[in-house]
């Protein structure tokens, strides 16, 4: 069964910078990826970026750079302009779609005990999954 993993990491050099890494584990080619924060996309979450393998990417603040790392994984750099760090307790969700076969979504957040530069383990936590 296809699964999605999500990692959130704080940059060691800039404590106001975060990077979200997401990947798809399964067969098939990915046709669209949506990254949201504050919850699943369309369920209280706010879109941060949409990535298409051929048409490019769209991103919204505070997303700084969305890019493909491999054909089945992406990264999204975030810039926290506030004095406090709201990203630390925020849930980030990634939805991978393989049109028209289906779509899969998982969420993750920065582990409470994370030191800067350390990332969450790539444990898949599917919250919405196509049958």
């Amino acid at each position: 069964t296809p699964e999605v993993w999500v990692q959130v990491q704080m940059e060691a050099t800039e404590l106001s910078s975060f990077t979200v890494h997401c990947g798809f584990l399964g067969p098939g080619s990915i046709s669209l990826v949506t990254v949201s924060w504050g919850g699943p996309d369309g369920a209280g979450g706010t879109k941060l970026a949409v990535l298409h393998p051929e048409l490019g990417t769209r991103q919204w603040a505070p997303a700084r750079q969305a890019r493909w790392e491999t054909q089945s994984s992406i990264s999204l750099a975030l810039e926290d302009s506030g004095a406090s760090s709201p990203f630390a307790n925020t849930t980030f969700c990634c939805k991978f779609a393989s049109f028209p076969e289906g779509s899969w979504e998982s969420c993750g957040s920065l582990p409470p005990s994370s030191d800067p530069g350390l990332s969450a383990p790539p444990t898949p936590v599917p919250i919405l999954r196509a049958d």
């Epitope: 669209l32 369309g42 048409l55 779609a97 289906g102 196509a130």
Partner: antibody, heavy 120, light 106 residues
């Protein structure tokens, strides 16, 4: 202006065959996934075939699998639906529709439809 | 396949009223769309990805929902809104539609 124009519908006997065409214009046809959707006399909408950009991958629901074949000619900007072993329940208006990637593959443009009647 | 159940099947409302119709899925869906169809015309995209308005759609239309429960709301009904509204998903193949909600104006 985006346009999708279906043709090829008509009256056919049960067990017969028919080939529908959808002529596309106003956009780069080869960049878009396309679907055939039918509307039954009861006004139900049913997806019967989907083909992605390159035309290699095709998808069908169980109701038409093995009987319908979707194909595309990107050079001619045309989508096709070959229907065989037709049954009375295939009677419907057949629409071709375009899927827009950045609209999460919503069907953002539809043709005017072509009517298919399967009856003896 | 995912079955979408729309309710009510038929509804009647007066111009200026707020109306809401629902779409319930047999299992959780990630992408929901709404289409409007008037008699003698092809379906027209209204809402994509649950809550985004398609180009040219009046702001009186809005969509919401998650998981298995979705809705389409028209804040102030106008005469031109008389139509049948369909929900559609593609979280898993085949793409499926609801049976529609027919909206009549009083």
């Amino acid at each position: 202006e985006v346009q999708l124009v279906e043709s090829g519908g008509g009256l056919v006997k049960p067990g017969g065959s028919l080939k529908l065409s959808c002529a596309a214009s106003g956009f780069t046809f080869s960049n878009f996934a396309m679907s055939w959707v039918r509307q039954t006399p009861a006004m139900r909408l049913e997806s019967v075939a989907t083909i992605v950009n390159g035309g290699i991958n095709t998808y069908y629901p169980d109701t038409v699998k093995g009987r319908f074949t979707v194909s595309r000619d990107n050079a001619k900007n045309t989508l096709y639906l070959q229907m065989s072993s037709l049954r009375s329940e295939d009677t419907a208006i057949y629409y071709c529709a375009r899927h827009d990637d950045f609209l999460y593959y919503a069907m953002d443009y539809w043709g005017q439809g072509t009517s298919v009647t399967v009856s003896s | 396949q995912i079955v979408l159940t729309q309710s009510p099947a038929i509804m009647s409302a007066s111009p200026g009223e707020k109306v809401t119709m629902t779409c319930s899925a047999s299992s959780s869906v990630n992408y929901m769309f709404w289409y409007q169809q008037k008699p003698g015309s092809s379906p027209r995209l209204l809402i994509y990805d649950t809550s985004n308005l398609a180009s040219g759609v009046p702001v009186r239309f809005s969509g919401s929902g998650s998981g298995t429960s979705y809705s389409l709301t028209i804040s102030r009904l106008e005469a031109e809104d008389a139509a049948t509204y369909y929900c559609q998903q593609w979280t898993s193949y085949p793409l499926t539609f609801g049976a529609g909600t027919k909206l009549d104006l009083k």
